[in-house]
Interface confidence: medium
């Protein structure tokens, strides 16, 4: 289980002195600087128990593994649910603390209830301040049960929940109807996913038999030990005032753990520290009792004395939980409660024992979870103990679980169970990510998701040119930082793979999937300059440029022309994909716009230096279209066009332009200028006989205007092939009767 403890200071005379502290004993907990160690979170959870809004609570981080919540101004701030979240990845764990108001109408006899699947849970709310009204029970904020106020038994309202299942877990409350919810009794029900003494996906595995009130975790079979106890089975007491999975944490203040509630990962829940009891954890254990909430009884034998923090303290010559074992009986010494090895390694495990008669090599054996017994390959005999060494065959995942070292002599026997965790070396599930590239270097993010087990101790990046048979180059990197692969060849594909390792022998995982990363081309260095430009219409601009002459081939794939419209804050980019091009026509520009123009050479994705910019002003757009265009055939080679001037002209027309095209023809249209803008009629000559033509026209002021409607007309028949259309204008009033 994750080593995470939520401490609540219950000295409640002054809410301003109240604080909650979340302490993590996990390696690298709370760093928050990278994906390997997310930060500790400590917050009030208002989803179920809502309290009146007050000033925001203050969160203070003390080093990397501790966070404290303060700033409670009134007792109602304290009531409700608080949670601490710690651990990384799949080990991310939430620890929950439920706070009851000491002045509530109803108080829980016991706040945390941990029960097994299928058990009957009984929640008991003690009447503290009686009200003659019904009591309503809620589960996770939803009403689901009422009790008449006459139904109290011995001053308690009981809620029986038969055959509980994991979904029944959550926050329960008992409230007098029409009373403030802050006067409720709040409970936490934790339902283990298995029946008593079982764990695992199908609840097929047997729990190790947790001692001293430890609770077997239904997912991994580990004992979650009460505060003040440690070891695989919680068999070992910490020194007074200490807690954490390795007794590494110290209770704050001079009175040790008095007045503190300890909340641990589910399925443990919350309790007082070892040696303390009561709703505010301020009462010392009664004689003969010890442990968290003083729930354990000493029952010491053979002159042992009861210590309220650790249990029986045995006189010389005796040991055991109740001092029931004579020192003549052999005893396993200093066996680690938990060992970790990597998959497919062949570790050596030592087991030391003492006793009278003295244990010899053959009297010590090692038993695996599947029942296989290993005999020691050698033993080291010292005056006070014998240490047997066992060579373990290649480890498989099924070897994870509880192993047992057993010693047997004529004086008796002893055994010690310890947990072996077989860890799978990490294997990247994805290829590393390319962040940026240059012609001779690649910047890579090695941080990828992985299968198997952490923590990650080293990350190796292997790379070599694609399709190469040469040895891989390897670089060992910090997992949290991006890596720059240097001294590479330009425009070359490299195969790049990640290999992760975890601590311990055989911790190197298989290489992850390869990815192809290609270095960039050499950067183009030549700076072009703009030779000139001219406007070909209100929305068209022709641009020409040059490059300096240098020896050798041109490093470049083409040119990028950029037009910046500062008024509108818009950039137009035009790609000229030939490195030989020195001119380009830009169309679709906005008439009457002031553009800044430059050109630069590109090679692959890299841009060279930009030319000095030029400033270009496009003329404004032209006039509206001429109106009522009409065509009339005059002969086999002549058609007369008539029209009306455009309306709402912004200025005097300089000319008209007529477009002539053979209907259905594939050739380019012919444009004919009408240079006398006062004209409203013109004759187009030199047309082919019996041919259908399309005509449209537009006016020009500073720029060309919009096209008129298109009109169709056919020349008359039997004419000879003409040279091509020409035009003759005259005023519309003349010549229409010819």
């Amino acid at each position: 289980a994750v080593d995470l403890t939520l401490l609540a200071n219950l000295r409640l005379t002054d809410p301003q002195r109240f604080f909650l502290t979340c302490v993590s004993g996990e390696a690298g907990a709370g760093r928050g600087s990278d994906a390997w160690g997310p930060p500790l979170l400590l917050e009030k959870d208002d989803r179920i128990v809502r309290t009146p809004p007050g000033p925001p609570l203050r969160l203070a981080r003390n080093g990397s593994h501790q966070v404290t919540l303060r700033g409670f101004s009134k007792p109602s701030d304290l009531v409700g649910v608080f949670s601490c979240v710690g651990g990384a990845g799949a080990r991310r764990t939430r620890v929950i603390y439920v706070h009851n108001s000491p002045g509530a109408h109803l108080l829980p006899d016991k706040v945390t209830h941990t029960v097994n699947k299928g058990d009957t849970a009984v929640l008991s709310a003690r009447v503290h301040k009686e009200k003659q009204t019904d009591v309503i029970w809620k589960s996770n904020g939803s009403y689901f049960y009422t009790l008449d106020w006459h139904e109290a038994q011995d001053g308690r309202f009981l809620l029986q929940l038969p055959n509980v299942q994991p979904p029944s877990s959550g926050i329960y409350s008992a409230t007098y109807l029409e009373a403030s919810p802050l006067g409720s009794a709040f409970f936490r029900l934790i339902v283990r996913g298995c029946g008593a003494g079982r764990w695992g996906p199908g609840c097929t595995k047997e729990c190790p038999g947790c001692l001293h009130g430890g609770v077997c975790h239904d997912h991994d079979g580990e004992c979650v030990c009460p505060p003040g106890f440690t070891g695989t089975r919680c068999e070992q007491a910490c020194r007074e005032g200490r807690f954490g999975q390795s007794c590494q944490e110290q209770c704050p203040g001079i009175s040790g753990c008095r007045g503190l509630t300890f909340c641990l990962p589910d399925p443990y829940g919350c309790s007082c520290g070892s040696g303390w009891r009561g709703s505010q954890c301020q009462e010392a254990c009664a004689p003969g009792h010890f442990g968290a909430d003083c729930r354990l009884q000493c029952q010491c034998q053979n002159g042992g004395t009861c210590d309220r923090f650790s249990g029986c303290v045995c006189p010389s010559g005796w040991h055991g939980v109740h001092c029931e074992k004579s020192d003549r009986i052999p005893q396993i010494l200093n066996m680690a409660s938990e060992l970790e090895f990597n998959l497919e390694t062949m570790p050596r495990i030592n087991c030391a024992a003492a006793g009278n008669p003295f244990p010899v090599r053959g009297s010590i054996e090692l038993r695996k979870p599947d029942g296989t017994v290993l005999l020691s390959t050698k033993a080291i005999v010292e005056p006070e103990k014998t240490t047997a060494e066992f060579e373990v065959p290649r480890l498989v995942l099924a070897d994870s679980g509880f192993w047992e070292c057993r010693v047997s002599t004529s004086g008796g026997q002893d055994s010690r169970r310890f947990k072996v965790n077989v860890k799978v070396p990490p294997v990247p599930l994805a290829a590393p990510r390319l962040l940026t590239k240059q012609s001779r270097q690649l910047v890579v993010s090695p941080l990828v998701s992985f299968s198997g087990d952490g923590p990650i101790s080293t990350v190796r990046l292997h790379y070599r040119p694609q399709d190469s048979t040469m040895d891989w180059s390897t670089i060992v990197v910090d997992p949290s930082e991006n890596v720059t692969l240097m001294n590479l060849r330009p425009k070359t594909g490299y195969s790049v793979r990640v290999q992760l390792s975890r601590p311990g022998e055989g911790g190197e995982g298989a290489w992850g999937p390869p990815t192809l990363m290609t270095t960039d081309c050499p950067e183009p260095l030549l700076q072009p300059w703009l030779e000139g430009w001219h406007v070909e219409g209100t929305d068209r601009l022709r641009v020409s440029w040059s490059l300096p002459l240098v020896p050798g081939p041109l490093v470049g794939d083409g040119f990028l022309l950029r037009l910046w419209d500062g008024t509108r804050g818009q950039e137009r980019r035009e790609n000229v994909s030939s490195p030989q091009a020195r001119t380009a026509l830009l169309t679709g520009l906005t008439p009457g716009t002031h553009y800044q123009l430059d050109v630069q050479l590109y090679h692959c994705t890299l841009l060279g230096p930009a030319s000095p910019p030029a400033h270009v002003l496009l003329p404004p757009s032209g006039p509206p279209a001429p109106r009522h265009l009409h065509a009339q055939a005059l002969s086999d080679s002549e058609i007369q066009l008539t029209w009306k001037h455009p309306e709402a002209l912004p200025g005097p027309i300089s000319k008209y332009v007529v477009e002539v095209q053979v209907a259905g023809g594939a050739g380019d249209p012919l444009w004919i200028d009408v240079d006398r803008p006062e004209e409203t009629s013109t004759i187009i000559r030199g047309l082919n006989a019996s041919t259908r033509y399309l005509f449209r026209m537009r006016a020009s002021i500073q720029g060309l205007g919009d096209w008129s409607n298109t009109v169709e007309e056919s020349t008359l028949g039997n004419g000879l092939q003409a040279e091509g259309p020409v035009q003759e204008s005259r005023a519309a009033e003349e010549g229409l009767d010819q």
């Epitope: 009204t133 019904d134 009403y143 689901f144 049960y145 009422t146 008449d148 139904e151 109807l177 029409e178």
Partner: antibody, heavy 118, light 109 residues
Framework: EVQLLESGGGLVQPGGSLRLSCAAS????????MEWVRQAPGKGLEWVSS????????YYADSVKGRFTISRDNSKNTLYLQMNSLRAEDTAVYYC???????????WGQGTLVTVSS | DIQMIQSPATLSLSPGERATLSCRAS??????LAWYQQKPGQAPRLLIY???NRATGIPARFSGSGSGTDFTLTISSLEPEDFAVYYC???????????FGGGTKVEIK
Amino acid sequence: EVQLLESGGGLVQPGGSLRLSCAASGFTFSRYGMEWVRQAPGKGLEWVSSIYPSGGWTYYADSVKGRFTISRDNSKNTLYLQMNSLRAEDTAVYYCARRGSGRYFDYWGQGTLVTVSS
Amino acid sequence: DIQMIQSPATLSLSPGERATLSCRASQSVSSYLAWYQQKPGQAPRLLIYDASNRATGIPARFSGSGSGTDFTLTISSLEPEDFAVYYCQQRSNWPPALTFGGGTKVEIK
């Protein structure tokens, strides 16, 4: 002696409204939950609505939810039932009852007849 | 919602005989059940609460039994004033709804 006296019944057209009252005496009215129960002619009993001692909590049968409103005035020792959008099927004798221990009806009034007809 | 089914609908007996009335709930109501007596033109009267407890002033010939889904009201020896309609009533713990059975009429044979 506990006494409950209903009033306010009568003939009303469908869609109309009526307000029933129940005057209580002989007990501390503000300490008890109160109920309305009705009985259609020739039929069985049907619970209509409950109100808790201070009036803060009320419950209704699905058949009247949204149309009927139960209320009380503890200073006047009186229980009320405001009936809106009345239907023919609301025709019944309406009893007010005191809720005793365990949410049973230990005292009943004599009832008032409500007839909904056009 | 919990349904309450009473049987029989009518029970024809003579004074002095034993009457056994049944009430069945569609799901368990624990022991949260009451019995009421109603005479023509009168309001109902509480006889039994919590399945087996006699209300104040109720004669000993009335007794209730049962829990869960099956309940019985027994009148050990019928008196002339006992001929009436009898209703059972449950109260559920959530939602706090109250349901009556359809009633059993005990008439003189």
